[in-house]
Interface confidence: low
Protein backbone atom coordinates (compact mmCIF):
# COMPACT_ATOMS: atom_id res chain seq x y z
CA UNK A 1 0.00 0.00 0.00
CA UNK A 2 2.95 2.36 -0.26
CA UNK A 3 1.97 5.22 -2.61
CA UNK A 4 3.95 4.95 -5.85
CA UNK A 5 4.79 8.67 -5.88
CA UNK A 6 6.57 8.32 -2.56
CA UNK A 7 9.13 6.00 -4.18
CA UNK A 8 10.31 8.93 -6.25
CA UNK A 9 12.82 11.31 -4.56
CA UNK A 10 11.17 14.18 -6.43
CA UNK A 11 8.07 13.77 -4.28
CA UNK A 12 10.00 14.39 -1.08
CA UNK A 13 12.25 17.08 -2.52
CA UNK A 14 9.29 19.02 -3.94
CA UNK A 15 7.33 18.70 -0.70
CA UNK A 16 10.29 19.89 1.38
CA UNK A 17 10.97 22.77 -1.00
CA UNK A 18 7.37 23.94 -0.59
CA UNK A 19 7.71 23.75 3.19
CA UNK A 20 11.00 25.63 3.01
CA UNK A 21 9.40 28.32 0.84
CA UNK A 22 6.62 28.77 3.37
CA UNK A 23 9.15 28.91 6.21
CA UNK A 24 11.20 31.61 4.44
CA UNK A 25 8.07 33.75 4.14
CA UNK A 26 7.36 33.66 7.87
CA UNK A 27 7.53 37.19 9.24
CA UNK A 28 7.24 37.80 12.98
CA UNK A 29 4.32 40.16 13.48
CA UNK A 30 5.25 43.33 15.36
CA UNK A 31 1.67 43.92 16.43
CA UNK A 32 -0.06 43.13 19.70
CA UNK A 33 -2.66 40.40 19.93
CA UNK A 34 -6.19 41.66 20.37
CA UNK A 35 -7.43 38.14 21.17
CA UNK A 36 -5.84 35.22 22.99
CA UNK A 37 -6.90 31.58 22.67
CA UNK A 38 -5.19 28.76 24.52
CA UNK A 39 -6.20 25.25 23.48
CA UNK A 40 -5.26 22.76 26.17
CA UNK A 41 -5.21 19.07 25.34
CA UNK A 42 -5.22 17.51 28.78
CA UNK A 43 -2.71 14.65 28.73
CA UNK A 44 -1.96 15.23 25.03
CA UNK A 45 1.68 14.24 24.89
CA UNK A 46 3.53 14.00 21.58
CA UNK A 47 2.78 10.28 21.21
CA UNK A 48 -0.93 11.14 21.53
CA UNK A 49 -0.65 13.84 18.86
CA UNK A 50 1.09 11.43 16.46
CA UNK A 51 -1.38 8.61 17.02
CA UNK A 52 -4.35 10.98 16.68
CA UNK A 53 -2.93 12.33 13.43
CA UNK A 54 -2.79 8.80 12.03
CA UNK A 55 -6.31 8.04 13.26
CA UNK A 56 -7.66 11.26 11.75
CA UNK A 57 -6.11 10.33 8.42
CA UNK A 58 -7.35 6.76 8.55
CA UNK A 59 -10.88 7.98 9.28
CA UNK A 60 -10.60 9.77 5.91
CA UNK A 61 -9.38 6.58 4.18
CA UNK A 62 -5.80 7.81 4.06
CA UNK A 63 -2.77 5.85 5.22
CA UNK A 64 -2.41 8.07 8.28
CA UNK A 65 0.84 9.85 9.12
CA UNK A 66 0.92 12.10 6.05
CA UNK A 67 -2.30 13.76 7.30
CA UNK A 68 -2.22 17.20 8.90
CA UNK A 69 -3.95 17.95 12.13
CA UNK A 70 -5.17 21.53 12.48
CA UNK A 71 -2.53 22.07 15.15
CA UNK A 72 0.16 20.80 12.75
CA UNK A 73 -0.45 23.87 10.58
CA UNK A 74 0.64 26.27 13.34
CA UNK A 75 3.98 27.73 12.21
CA UNK A 76 5.82 27.98 15.54
CA UNK A 77 6.56 25.16 17.97
CA UNK A 78 8.36 24.87 21.30
CA UNK A 79 8.78 22.25 23.98
CA UNK A 80 7.38 22.83 27.45
CA UNK A 81 8.91 21.40 30.65
CA UNK A 82 5.95 20.30 32.72
CA UNK A 83 7.39 19.35 36.12
CA UNK A 84 5.83 20.94 39.21
CA UNK A 85 7.87 22.43 42.05
CA UNK A 86 7.53 19.24 44.10
CA UNK A 87 7.14 16.47 41.48
CA UNK A 88 9.01 15.36 38.37
CA UNK A 89 5.67 14.21 36.94
CA UNK A 90 2.89 16.74 37.54
CA UNK A 91 -0.90 16.83 37.78
CA UNK A 92 -3.32 19.09 35.95
CA UNK A 93 -3.63 21.53 38.86
CA UNK A 94 0.01 22.50 39.20
CA UNK A 95 0.41 22.65 35.43
CA UNK A 96 -2.65 24.87 35.01
CA UNK A 97 -1.08 27.29 37.45
CA UNK A 98 2.04 27.30 35.28
CA UNK A 99 0.57 27.87 31.82
CA UNK A 100 -2.32 30.09 32.95
CA UNK A 101 -0.69 32.09 35.76
CA UNK A 102 2.98 31.96 34.79
CA UNK A 103 4.17 30.55 38.14
CA UNK A 104 4.91 26.93 39.07
CA UNK A 105 3.13 25.46 42.06
CA UNK A 106 2.82 22.21 43.96
CA UNK A 107 1.09 18.99 42.94
CA UNK A 108 -2.74 19.17 43.17
CA UNK A 109 -2.87 22.87 44.08
CA UNK A 110 -4.34 25.49 41.76
CA UNK A 111 -3.67 29.20 41.33
CA UNK A 112 -1.18 29.28 44.19
CA UNK A 113 2.57 29.60 44.36
CA UNK A 114 4.65 26.74 45.74
CA UNK A 115 4.62 28.42 49.14
CA UNK A 116 1.14 26.92 49.50
CA UNK A 117 0.85 23.31 50.66
CA UNK A 118 -1.55 20.70 49.34
CA UNK A 119 -4.68 20.37 51.49
CA UNK A 120 -3.50 22.95 54.04
CA UNK A 121 -6.11 25.69 53.91
CA UNK A 122 -4.13 28.11 56.03
CA UNK A 123 -1.38 28.27 53.40
CA UNK A 124 -3.73 29.75 50.80
CA UNK A 125 -3.92 33.41 51.73
CA UNK A 126 -1.09 35.55 50.39
CA UNK A 127 0.09 32.87 47.96
CA UNK A 128 -2.51 33.48 45.24
CA UNK A 129 -1.22 34.02 41.71
CA UNK A 130 -3.32 35.78 39.07
CA UNK A 131 -4.20 34.16 35.76
CA UNK A 132 -3.78 35.74 32.35
CA UNK A 133 -7.55 35.41 31.95
CA UNK A 134 -8.07 37.55 35.03
CA UNK A 135 -5.59 40.12 33.73
CA UNK A 136 -7.33 40.12 30.33
CA UNK A 137 -10.65 40.84 32.04
CA UNK A 138 -9.11 43.74 33.96
CA UNK A 139 -7.90 45.11 30.63
CA UNK A 140 -11.48 45.21 29.34
CA UNK A 141 -11.49 42.03 27.30
CA UNK A 142 -14.25 39.43 27.38
CA UNK A 143 -13.18 36.06 28.73
CA UNK A 144 -14.37 32.49 28.44
CA UNK A 145 -13.73 28.95 29.61
CA UNK A 146 -14.75 25.92 27.53
CA UNK A 147 -14.05 22.33 28.55
CA UNK A 148 -15.28 18.78 28.12
CA UNK A 149 -14.67 18.13 31.82
CA UNK A 150 -16.40 19.79 34.75
CA UNK A 151 -15.89 23.54 34.58
CA UNK A 152 -14.63 23.23 38.16
CA UNK A 153 -11.94 20.73 37.10
CA UNK A 154 -8.24 21.40 37.62
CA UNK A 155 -7.35 22.83 34.20
CA UNK A 156 -10.18 25.36 33.80
CA UNK A 157 -9.97 26.22 37.51
CA UNK A 158 -6.45 27.50 36.90
CA UNK A 159 -8.04 30.42 35.07
CA UNK A 160 -10.09 31.66 38.02
CA UNK A 161 -9.52 29.74 41.27
CA UNK A 162 -7.05 29.53 44.13
CA UNK A 163 -7.20 26.30 46.10
CA UNK A 164 -4.89 24.01 48.02
CA UNK A 165 -6.92 21.01 46.88
CA UNK A 166 -8.07 20.55 43.30
CA UNK A 167 -10.77 18.11 44.49
CA UNK A 168 -12.76 20.76 46.37
CA UNK A 169 -15.36 21.03 43.60
CA UNK A 170 -18.30 21.98 45.85
CA UNK A 171 -18.54 22.83 49.53
CA UNK A 172 -19.48 19.20 50.20
CA UNK A 173 -15.92 18.28 49.16
CA UNK A 174 -14.26 20.80 51.51
CA UNK A 175 -13.55 19.59 55.06
CA UNK A 176 -15.48 21.51 57.72
CA UNK A 177 -12.22 22.74 59.24
CA UNK A 178 -11.11 24.25 55.92
CA UNK A 179 -14.53 25.84 55.42
CA UNK A 180 -14.27 27.43 58.86
CA UNK A 181 -10.83 28.77 57.95
CA UNK A 182 -12.42 30.50 54.95
CA UNK A 183 -11.37 28.21 52.11
CA UNK A 184 -13.95 28.29 49.34
CA UNK A 185 -14.88 25.48 47.01
CA UNK A 186 -14.04 25.84 43.32
CA UNK A 187 -17.67 26.21 42.16
CA UNK A 188 -18.13 29.18 44.48
CA UNK A 189 -14.92 30.73 43.17
CA UNK A 190 -16.14 30.21 39.60
CA UNK A 191 -18.95 32.71 40.12
CA UNK A 192 -17.36 35.01 42.68
CA UNK A 193 -13.64 35.46 41.99
CA UNK A 194 -14.06 37.23 38.68
CA UNK A 195 -16.56 38.03 35.97
CA UNK A 196 -16.35 35.28 33.34
CA UNK A 197 -18.44 36.01 30.25
CA UNK A 198 -18.70 32.46 28.89
CA UNK A 199 -18.56 29.24 30.92
CA UNK A 200 -19.23 26.03 28.98
CA UNK A 201 -18.69 22.42 30.02
CA UNK A 202 -19.92 19.96 32.62
CA UNK A 203 -20.34 20.29 36.37
CA UNK A 204 -24.01 21.06 37.06
CA UNK A 205 -24.20 19.16 40.31
CA UNK A 206 -21.66 21.34 42.10
CA UNK A 207 -23.77 24.45 41.52
CA UNK A 208 -27.01 23.39 43.21
CA UNK A 209 -28.15 22.48 46.72
CA UNK A 210 -28.23 18.88 47.89
CA UNK A 211 -31.55 17.36 46.95
CA UNK A 212 -31.95 19.40 43.76
CA UNK A 213 -32.85 16.97 40.98
CA UNK A 214 -30.77 17.21 37.83
CA UNK A 215 -32.88 18.40 34.87
CA UNK A 216 -31.53 15.68 32.58
CA UNK A 217 -31.49 12.82 35.11
CA UNK A 218 -34.19 13.79 37.62
CA UNK A 219 -34.65 10.26 38.91
CA UNK A 220 -30.96 9.67 39.59
CA UNK A 221 -30.25 11.06 43.05
CA UNK A 222 -26.48 10.70 42.56
CA UNK A 223 -26.62 13.22 39.70
CA UNK A 224 -28.44 15.89 41.68
CA UNK A 225 -27.09 18.92 43.52
CA UNK A 226 -24.30 18.36 46.02
CA UNK A 227 -24.10 21.68 47.86
CA UNK A 228 -24.46 21.74 51.64
CA UNK A 229 -24.72 25.53 51.94
CA UNK A 230 -28.13 25.57 50.24
CA UNK A 231 -26.88 27.96 47.58
CA UNK A 232 -28.02 27.91 43.99
CA UNK A 233 -24.87 29.25 42.37
CA UNK A 234 -26.48 29.40 38.93
CA UNK A 235 -29.22 31.70 40.19
CA UNK A 236 -26.64 33.81 42.00
CA UNK A 237 -24.63 34.09 38.80
CA UNK A 238 -27.72 34.93 36.72
CA UNK A 239 -28.68 37.66 39.17
CA UNK A 240 -25.28 39.33 38.71
CA UNK A 241 -25.68 40.07 35.02
CA UNK A 242 -28.62 41.57 33.20
CA UNK A 243 -27.87 39.69 29.99
CA UNK A 244 -26.97 36.39 31.62
CA UNK A 245 -28.34 33.11 30.31
CA UNK A 246 -27.98 29.60 31.70
CA UNK A 247 -28.42 26.61 29.39
CA UNK A 248 -28.06 22.90 29.94
CA UNK A 249 -28.61 21.38 26.51
CA UNK A 250 -27.32 21.78 22.97
CA UNK A 251 -30.47 23.32 21.46
CA UNK A 252 -30.57 26.09 24.01
CA UNK A 253 -26.82 26.70 23.65
CA UNK A 254 -27.14 27.21 19.92
CA UNK A 255 -30.08 29.57 20.43
CA UNK A 256 -28.33 31.55 23.15
CA UNK A 257 -25.14 31.96 21.14
CA UNK A 258 -27.12 33.73 18.39
CA UNK A 259 -29.16 35.91 20.76
CA UNK A 260 -27.78 39.48 20.79
CA UNK A 261 -29.35 40.12 24.21
CA UNK A 262 -27.14 37.46 25.82
CA UNK A 263 -23.99 39.03 27.26
CA UNK A 264 -23.01 36.25 29.67
CA UNK A 265 -23.52 32.57 28.99
CA UNK A 266 -23.18 29.58 31.30
CA UNK A 267 -23.79 26.17 29.80
CA UNK A 268 -23.46 23.11 32.00
CA UNK A 269 -24.32 20.06 29.96
CA UNK A 270 -23.73 17.19 32.38
CA UNK A 271 -23.83 16.81 36.18
CA UNK A 272 -20.11 15.93 36.15
CA UNK A 273 -17.72 15.64 33.23
CA UNK A 274 -19.23 15.71 29.78
CA UNK A 275 -19.58 12.40 28.01
CA UNK A 276 -16.80 11.08 25.81
CA UNK A 277 -17.30 12.14 22.20
CA UNK A 278 -18.06 8.54 21.23
CA UNK A 279 -20.85 8.36 23.86
CA UNK A 280 -22.23 11.87 23.40
CA UNK A 281 -25.97 12.29 22.81
CA UNK A 282 -25.73 14.81 19.98
CA UNK A 283 -29.32 15.97 20.51
CA UNK A 284 -28.67 16.97 24.13
CA UNK A 285 -24.96 17.68 24.53
CA UNK A 286 -22.89 19.96 22.29
CA UNK A 287 -19.50 18.87 21.00
CA UNK A 288 -16.33 20.69 21.98
CA UNK A 289 -16.32 22.23 18.51
CA UNK A 290 -19.86 23.54 18.98
CA UNK A 291 -19.07 24.94 22.42
CA UNK A 292 -15.97 26.64 21.04
CA UNK A 293 -17.97 28.19 18.21
CA UNK A 294 -20.66 29.41 20.61
CA UNK A 295 -18.03 30.95 22.87
CA UNK A 296 -16.33 32.73 19.98
CA UNK A 297 -19.62 34.13 18.69
CA UNK A 298 -20.26 35.79 22.05
CA UNK A 299 -16.74 36.83 22.93
CA UNK A 300 -15.88 38.32 19.55
CA UNK A 301 -18.51 41.06 20.02
CA UNK A 302 -16.13 42.90 22.33
CA UNK A 303 -14.12 45.48 20.36
CA UNK A 304 -11.34 45.24 22.95
CA UNK A 305 -10.89 41.56 22.23
CA UNK A 306 -11.11 38.40 24.28
CA UNK A 307 -9.29 35.61 26.11
CA UNK A 308 -10.57 32.06 25.59
CA UNK A 309 -9.48 28.84 27.25
CA UNK A 310 -10.57 25.69 25.38
CA UNK A 311 -9.83 22.31 26.91
CA UNK A 312 -10.06 18.86 25.42
CA UNK A 313 -10.13 17.55 28.96
CA UNK A 314 -11.08 13.94 28.48
CA UNK A 315 -8.06 12.93 26.40
CA UNK A 316 -6.51 12.50 29.83
CA UNK A 317 -9.41 10.40 31.12
CA UNK A 318 -9.20 8.00 28.20
CA UNK A 319 -5.52 7.48 28.89
CA UNK A 320 -6.05 6.96 32.62
CA UNK A 321 -8.44 4.15 31.67
CA UNK A 322 -5.82 2.78 29.23
CA UNK A 323 -8.45 3.10 26.51
CA UNK A 324 -6.53 4.63 23.64
CA UNK A 325 -9.62 4.68 21.42
CA UNK A 326 -11.28 7.15 23.79
CA UNK A 327 -8.18 9.28 24.22
CA UNK A 328 -7.56 9.53 20.49
CA UNK A 329 -11.16 10.25 19.48
CA UNK A 330 -11.18 13.00 22.12
CA UNK A 331 -7.97 14.37 20.61
CA UNK A 332 -9.55 14.46 17.15
CA UNK A 333 -12.56 16.40 18.45
CA UNK A 334 -10.14 18.76 20.19
CA UNK A 335 -8.36 19.25 16.88
CA UNK A 336 -11.70 19.85 15.14
CA UNK A 337 -12.36 22.63 17.66
CA UNK A 338 -8.98 24.17 16.86
CA UNK A 339 -9.81 24.05 13.15
CA UNK A 340 -13.21 25.68 13.66
CA UNK A 341 -11.73 28.41 15.81
CA UNK A 342 -9.23 29.12 13.04
CA UNK A 343 -12.09 29.63 10.62
CA UNK A 344 -13.84 32.04 12.98
CA UNK A 345 -10.81 34.15 13.90
CA UNK A 346 -7.97 35.88 12.10
CA UNK A 347 -4.30 35.22 12.74
CA UNK A 348 -3.80 38.93 12.13
CA UNK A 349 -5.20 39.77 15.55
CA UNK A 350 -5.53 36.47 17.42
CA UNK A 351 -2.69 34.63 19.14
CA UNK A 352 -3.64 30.96 19.29
CA UNK A 353 -1.62 28.48 21.32
CA UNK A 354 -2.09 24.72 21.49
CA UNK A 355 -0.41 22.70 24.20
CA UNK A 356 -0.77 19.94 26.76
CA UNK A 357 -0.47 20.17 30.50
CA UNK A 358 1.43 16.88 30.69
CA UNK A 359 1.92 13.63 28.83
CA UNK A 360 0.95 10.01 29.57
CA UNK A 361 2.90 6.76 29.63
CA UNK A 362 1.39 5.99 26.22
CA UNK A 363 3.57 4.54 23.51
CA UNK A 364 3.28 3.87 19.80
CA UNK A 365 5.72 1.36 18.37
CA UNK A 366 6.44 -2.15 17.15
CA UNK A 367 7.15 -1.41 13.44
CA UNK A 368 3.56 -1.54 12.13
CA UNK A 369 3.09 -1.40 8.39
CA UNK A 370 2.13 1.93 6.85
CA UNK A 371 -1.66 2.16 6.58
CA UNK A 372 -2.32 -0.52 9.19
CA UNK A 373 -4.88 0.41 11.84
CA UNK A 374 -3.54 2.57 14.64
CA UNK A 375 -5.45 0.23 16.98
CA UNK A 376 -4.01 -2.85 15.31
CA UNK A 377 -1.29 -5.37 16.05
CA UNK A 378 2.42 -5.13 15.46
CA UNK A 379 3.75 -7.54 12.81
CA UNK A 380 5.04 -10.81 14.23
CA UNK A 381 4.79 -12.09 17.77
CA UNK A 382 6.34 -11.17 21.08
CA UNK A 383 8.77 -13.49 22.90
CA UNK A 384 5.82 -15.17 24.59
CA UNK A 385 4.58 -16.11 21.09
CA UNK A 386 1.56 -13.85 21.42
CA UNK A 387 0.46 -10.82 19.46
CA UNK A 388 0.81 -7.30 20.83
CA UNK A 389 -0.71 -3.96 19.92
CA UNK A 390 1.24 -1.03 18.52
CA UNK A 391 -0.32 1.17 21.20
CA UNK A 392 0.70 0.29 24.75
CA UNK A 393 0.94 1.86 28.20
CA UNK A 394 3.85 1.73 30.61
CA UNK A 395 1.46 1.18 33.49
CA UNK A 396 -2.26 1.06 34.10
CA UNK A 397 -5.36 -1.11 34.30
CA UNK A 398 -4.58 -2.89 31.02
CA UNK A 399 -2.16 -5.18 32.85
CA UNK A 400 -3.82 -8.59 33.04
CA UNK A 401 -2.45 -11.98 33.95
CA UNK A 402 -4.41 -14.94 32.60
CA UNK A 403 -3.19 -18.22 34.10
CA UNK A 404 0.02 -16.44 35.04
CA UNK A 405 0.64 -15.12 31.55
CA UNK A 406 -0.12 -12.13 29.35
CA UNK A 407 -3.31 -12.68 27.34
CA UNK A 408 -3.13 -12.97 23.59
CA UNK A 409 -4.92 -10.28 21.59
CA UNK A 410 -6.65 -10.25 18.21
CA UNK A 411 -7.15 -7.36 15.80
CA UNK A 412 -10.90 -7.37 16.42
CA UNK A 413 -10.39 -7.12 20.18
CA UNK A 414 -7.84 -4.32 19.96
CA UNK A 415 -10.05 -2.33 17.61
CA UNK A 416 -12.92 -2.16 20.09
CA UNK A 417 -13.62 1.27 21.61
CA UNK A 418 -13.69 -0.37 25.03
CA UNK A 419 -10.38 -2.23 24.66
CA UNK A 420 -7.73 -1.45 27.27
CA UNK A 421 -4.21 -1.56 25.85
CA UNK A 422 -1.85 -3.69 27.88
CA UNK A 423 0.70 -2.30 30.30
CA UNK A 424 3.88 -3.47 32.03
CA UNK A 425 2.78 -2.55 35.55
CA UNK A 426 -0.68 -3.05 37.08
CA UNK A 427 -2.34 0.13 38.39
CA UNK A 428 -5.97 1.11 38.87
CA UNK A 429 -5.32 4.18 36.78
CA UNK A 430 -2.58 4.77 34.23
CA UNK A 431 -0.28 7.65 35.19
CA UNK A 432 0.88 10.89 33.66
CA UNK A 433 4.35 10.99 32.13
CA UNK A 434 7.07 13.54 32.69
CA UNK A 435 8.51 14.21 29.25
CA UNK A 436 8.23 17.61 27.60
CA UNK A 437 5.11 18.44 25.63
CA UNK A 438 4.68 20.51 22.49
CA UNK A 439 3.45 24.09 22.29
CA UNK A 440 2.08 25.16 18.89
CA UNK A 441 1.60 28.87 18.15
CA UNK A 442 0.03 31.06 15.48
CA UNK A 443 -0.73 34.78 15.32
CA UNK A 444 0.78 37.97 16.74
CA UNK A 445 3.96 37.24 18.75
CA UNK A 446 3.75 33.52 18.00
CA UNK A 447 7.42 33.66 16.98
CA UNK A 448 8.30 33.95 20.68
CA UNK A 449 7.24 30.33 21.07
CA UNK A 450 10.54 28.58 20.35
CA UNK A 451 13.11 26.33 21.95
CA UNK A 452 12.73 24.40 25.18
CA UNK A 453 10.94 26.47 27.80
CA UNK A 454 9.46 26.19 31.24
CA UNK A 455 5.69 25.70 31.07
CA UNK A 456 5.29 29.08 32.79
CA UNK A 457 6.63 30.74 29.64
CA UNK A 458 3.26 30.14 27.95
CA UNK A 459 1.40 32.50 30.28
CA UNK A 460 4.09 35.13 29.86
CA UNK A 461 3.94 34.94 26.06
CA UNK A 462 0.17 35.46 26.18
CA UNK A 463 0.45 38.35 28.61
CA UNK A 464 3.19 40.03 26.60
CA UNK A 465 1.46 39.52 23.26
CA UNK A 466 -1.69 41.26 24.50
CA UNK A 467 0.20 43.86 26.58
CA UNK A 468 -1.35 42.60 29.81
CA UNK A 469 0.20 42.88 33.26
CA UNK A 470 3.11 42.80 33.86
CA UNK A 471 3.82 43.73 30.24
CA UNK A 472 1.54 46.74 29.84
CA UNK A 473 4.58 48.65 28.50
CA UNK A 474 5.03 46.00 25.81
CA UNK A 475 5.85 48.56 23.07
CA UNK A 476 3.92 46.58 20.46
CA UNK A 477 1.98 48.37 17.75
CA UNK A 478 -1.78 47.93 18.08
CA UNK A 479 -3.23 45.92 15.23
CA UNK A 480 -4.42 48.11 12.37
CA UNK A 481 -8.12 48.77 12.81
CA UNK A 482 -8.21 47.96 16.50
CA UNK A 483 -11.06 49.79 18.17
CA UNK A 484 -11.42 50.68 21.80
Amino acid sequence: IIPVEEENPDFWNRQAAEALGAAKKLQPAQTAAKNLIIFLGDGMGVSTVTAARILKGQKKDKLGPETFLAMDRFPYVALSKTYSVDKHVPDSGATATAYLCGVKGNFQTIGLSAAARFNQCNTTRGNEVISVMNRAKKAGKSVGVVTTTRVQHASPAGAYAHTVNRNWYSDADVPASARQEGCQDIATQLISNMDIDVILGGGRKYMFPMGTPDPEYPDDYSQGGTRLDGKNLVQEWLAKHQGARYVWNRTELLQASLDPSVTHLMGLFEPGDMKYEIHRDSTLDPSLMEMTEAALLLLSRNPRGFFLFVEGGRIDHGHHESRAYRALTETIMFDDAIERAGQLTSEEDTLSLVTADHSHVFSFGGYPLRGSSIFGLAPGKARDRKAYTVLLYGNGPGYVLKDGARPDVTESESGSPEYRQQSAVPLDGETHAGEDVAVFARGPQAHLVHGVQEQTFIAHVMAFAACLEPYTACDLAPRAGTTD
Epitope: F208, P209, G230, V234, Q235, L238, T251
Partner: nanobody
Protein backbone atom coordinates in the same frame (compact mmCIF):
# COMPACT_ATOMS: atom_id res chain seq x y z
CA UNK B 1 -38.90 28.01 22.22
CA UNK B 2 -40.83 27.05 25.34
CA UNK B 3 -44.52 26.09 25.17
CA UNK B 4 -46.80 25.92 28.20
CA UNK B 5 -50.23 24.29 28.31
CA UNK B 6 -52.47 24.55 31.38
CA UNK B 7 -55.17 22.07 32.34
CA UNK B 8 -57.24 21.10 35.37
CA UNK B 9 -59.54 24.11 35.62
CA UNK B 10 -63.27 23.82 36.17
CA UNK B 11 -66.20 24.55 38.43
CA UNK B 12 -65.79 23.87 42.14
CA UNK B 13 -67.69 24.77 45.29
CA UNK B 14 -66.27 27.16 47.86
CA UNK B 15 -64.04 25.27 50.29
CA UNK B 16 -63.20 22.68 47.63
CA UNK B 17 -59.90 21.87 45.90
CA UNK B 18 -58.48 21.82 42.37
CA UNK B 19 -55.12 20.91 40.94
CA UNK B 20 -53.93 22.82 37.89
CA UNK B 21 -51.21 21.39 35.66
CA UNK B 22 -48.81 23.23 33.38
CA UNK B 23 -47.07 21.01 30.83
CA UNK B 24 -43.82 22.53 29.58
CA UNK B 25 -42.44 21.46 26.22
CA UNK B 26 -39.48 22.59 24.17
CA UNK B 27 -37.27 21.57 27.09
CA UNK B 28 -37.59 24.55 29.36
CA UNK B 29 -34.19 25.73 30.42
CA UNK B 30 -33.03 25.26 33.93
CA UNK B 31 -32.89 29.00 34.44
CA UNK B 32 -36.59 29.32 33.63
CA UNK B 33 -38.83 29.34 36.67
CA UNK B 34 -42.54 28.66 36.80
CA UNK B 35 -44.93 31.40 37.80
CA UNK B 36 -48.71 31.17 38.25
CA UNK B 37 -50.90 34.20 37.59
CA UNK B 38 -54.63 34.82 37.42
CA UNK B 39 -56.97 37.34 35.85
CA UNK B 40 -60.49 37.85 37.16
CA UNK B 41 -63.15 39.44 34.89
CA UNK B 42 -62.59 43.18 34.58
CA UNK B 43 -59.37 43.09 36.61
CA UNK B 44 -55.66 43.10 35.79
CA UNK B 45 -53.63 39.95 35.77
CA UNK B 46 -52.07 39.32 39.20
CA UNK B 47 -49.27 37.20 40.59
CA UNK B 48 -50.26 34.05 42.49
CA UNK B 49 -47.09 32.00 43.09
CA UNK B 50 -43.75 31.05 41.63
CA UNK B 51 -41.10 28.38 42.10
CA UNK B 52 -37.55 28.22 40.79
CA UNK B 53 -36.88 25.24 38.54
CA UNK B 54 -34.76 23.50 41.18
CA UNK B 55 -37.20 24.13 44.01
CA UNK B 56 -34.77 26.24 45.98
CA UNK B 57 -37.04 29.30 46.08
CA UNK B 58 -40.84 29.50 46.34
CA UNK B 59 -43.04 32.55 46.83
CA UNK B 60 -46.81 33.04 47.24
CA UNK B 61 -49.02 36.09 47.14
CA UNK B 62 -50.42 36.85 50.59
CA UNK B 63 -53.96 36.20 49.36
CA UNK B 64 -53.22 32.51 48.67
CA UNK B 65 -50.56 31.75 51.27
CA UNK B 66 -51.37 28.58 53.19
CA UNK B 67 -54.04 27.54 50.70
CA UNK B 68 -52.12 27.12 47.43
CA UNK B 69 -49.01 25.03 46.80
CA UNK B 70 -46.83 25.18 43.69
CA UNK B 71 -44.67 22.21 42.72
CA UNK B 72 -42.55 21.08 39.79
CA UNK B 73 -42.13 17.52 38.56
CA UNK B 74 -38.96 17.60 36.50
CA UNK B 75 -39.38 14.09 35.16
CA UNK B 76 -42.68 15.05 33.53
CA UNK B 77 -41.66 18.63 32.67
CA UNK B 78 -44.82 19.69 34.46
CA UNK B 79 -45.64 22.28 37.10
CA UNK B 80 -48.65 22.08 39.39
CA UNK B 81 -50.75 24.51 41.41
CA UNK B 82 -52.62 22.71 44.17
CA UNK B 83 -55.48 24.95 45.30
CA UNK B 84 -57.47 24.15 48.46
CA UNK B 85 -59.94 26.04 50.66
CA UNK B 86 -61.06 27.84 47.54
CA UNK B 87 -63.03 31.09 47.85
CA UNK B 88 -65.38 32.76 45.38
CA UNK B 89 -62.79 35.52 44.94
CA UNK B 90 -60.38 32.91 43.52
CA UNK B 91 -62.56 32.77 40.38
CA UNK B 92 -60.34 33.73 37.43
CA UNK B 93 -58.47 32.49 34.39
CA UNK B 94 -55.21 30.97 35.69
CA UNK B 95 -52.04 31.21 33.62
CA UNK B 96 -48.66 29.57 34.05
CA UNK B 97 -45.55 31.29 32.75
CA UNK B 98 -41.82 30.60 32.42
CA UNK B 99 -39.62 33.42 33.64
CA UNK B 100 -36.12 34.47 34.55
CA UNK B 101 -34.67 36.71 37.19
CA UNK B 102 -32.33 39.60 36.53
CA UNK B 103 -31.02 41.98 39.12
CA UNK B 104 -31.83 44.97 36.95
CA UNK B 105 -35.38 44.05 36.03
CA UNK B 106 -36.43 41.53 38.65
CA UNK B 107 -38.68 38.68 37.53
CA UNK B 108 -39.65 38.66 33.87
CA UNK B 109 -41.85 36.06 32.22
CA UNK B 110 -41.11 35.38 28.58
CA UNK B 111 -43.44 32.48 27.86
CA UNK B 112 -47.12 32.15 28.76
CA UNK B 113 -49.77 29.46 28.57
CA UNK B 114 -53.24 30.08 27.12
CA UNK B 115 -54.91 29.94 30.54
CA UNK B 116 -57.49 27.69 32.21
CA UNK B 117 -60.77 28.88 33.76
CA UNK B 118 -61.41 28.27 37.47
CA UNK B 119 -64.87 29.10 38.79
CA UNK B 120 -65.62 28.89 42.50
CA UNK B 121 -69.34 28.92 43.31
CA UNK B 122 -70.92 29.60 46.66
Amino acid sequence: QVQLVESGGGLVQAGGSLRLSCAVSGRALSDYNIGWFRQAPGKEREFVARKTWDGSSTRYDDSVKGRFTVSIEDAKNTAYLQMSSLKTEDTAVYYCAAGRYSRARGWEYDYWGQGTQVTVSS
